[in-house]
């Protein structure tokens, strides 16, 4: 069975700042990456980024910068700063879109002890 | 304007083959992924088989797994579906549909149809 | 399998009233559910996907609404074009299941 993995990491140098990792592990072809906040993007969450492997990448604020890791993982940079911008707490969602399997998709958020650079 | 269009319907006995073929234009072949949806007369809509982009990954419903093939040349802007041992139950329409991944893999454009008929 | 089921199968309605098609999953599809329109002798048309877009063209009247397993198609005034049978779709999960239609007929 397919999986999805999420990593939530507070930068030391911006402690606004947050880069999200997300990983499919799984065979199929990725069609779509949807990165969210808030919860999933079909409960609510509010969308970050979407990433396609061929026809680019949409990202909106607070999303600085979104790219493609791997054929399957990708990573998330969030600026740090204004009213839209994430708090420790805040969850953040990575849906895999895999043709013909389907999507699969994860949460993830800061660990409630985690010092500034500590990976979730 | 995205067009579709099926050909290579008939009648046909039991146990017989037919190949359908579906011409795509309007859009980059390449880019999408591609299914067959059929439907019965009086019964609803069923996807028989889809195929990636790439053709590297293909679906089939246990009804027709081991009997149908799917299969695309991208060269061509072409999709085809090989049909083997065909029984009674596999008279349909049988529709050529473009998934769109940016709409979770809805199905935005599909062809006229053509009609299979498995009978003696 | 995500069983996709439509009710009811049959709604005898006039032009001018509102209308709400109903699909339950078997279960969570995520926000992955379109809908989809067939007239006799045509093929099937998107109305809506990821539950709640409407598809380039489909008029206003069309919306859709739902989260994690149950999802609504309404139509808020019925024009006679749209006596035709809706079919809800998932595509969260393969196999990619349809449910079974609703068929709107003219009262």
């Known amino acids: 069975t397919p999986e999805v993995w999420v990593q939530v990491r507070m930068e030391a140098t911006e402690l606004s700042s947050f880069t999200i990792r997300c990983g499919f592990l799984g065979s199929g072809s990725i069609s779509l990456v949807t990165v969210s906040w808030g919860g999933p993007n079909g409960a609510g969450g509010t969308t970050l980024a979407v990433l396609h492997p061929e026809r680019g990448i949409r990202q909106w604020a607070p999303a600085r910068q979104a790219r493609w890791e791997t054929q399957s993982s990708i990573s998330l940079i969030l600026e740090g700063s204004g009213a839209s911008s994430p708090c420790a707490n805040t969850t953040f969602c990575c849906k895999f879109a895999s043709f013909p399997e389907g999507s699969w998709e994860a949460c993830g958020s800061l660990p409630p002890s985690s010092d500034p650079g500590l990976s979730a | 304007e995205v067009q579709l269009v099926e050909s290579g319907g008939g009648l046909v006995k039991p146990g017989g083959s037919l190949r359908l073929s579906c011409a795509a234009s309007?859009?980059?072949?390449?880019?999408?992924?591609m299914s067959w949806v059929r439907q019965a007369p009086g019964k609803g809509l069923e996807l028989v088989s889809a195929?990636?982009?790439?053709?590297?990954?293909?679906y089939y419903p246990d009804t027709v797994k081991g009997r149908f093939t799917i299969s695309r040349d991208n060269a061509k802007n072409s999709l085809y579906l090989q049909m083997n041992s065909l029984r009674a139950e596999d008279t349909a329409v049988y529709y050529c549909?473009?998934?769109?991944?940016?709409?979770?893999?809805?199905?935005?454009?599909w062809g006229q149809g053509t009609l299979v008929t498995v009978s003696s | 399998e995500i069983v996709m089921t439509q009710s009811p199968p049959t709604l005898s309605l006039s032009p001018g009233e509102r209308v709400t098609l109903s699909c339950k999953a078997s279960?969570?599809?995520?926000?992955?559910v379109a809908w989809y329109q067939e007239k006799p002798g045509q093929a099937p048309r998107l109305l809506i996907y990821?539950?709640?877009h409407r598809f380039t063209g489909i008029p206003a009247r069309f919306s859709g609404s739902g989260s994690g397993t149950d999802f609504t198609l309404t139509i808020s005034s019925l024009q006679p074009e749209d006596f035709a049978v809706y079919y809800c779709?998932?595509?969260?999960?393969?196999?990619?299941?349809f449910g079974q239609g609703t068929k709107l007929e003219i009262k």
């Open positions: 549909s473009r998934h769109e991944d940016y709409f979770g893999f809805a199905m935005d454009s």
């Open positions: 309007g859009f980059t072949f390449s880019s999408y992924h």
């Open positions: 195929i990636s982009r790439d053709g590297d990954s293909t």
């Open positions: 279960q969570s599809v995520s926000n992955d």
């Open positions: 990821y539950v709640s």
């Open positions: 779709h998932q595509a969260y999960r393969s196999p990619w299941t």
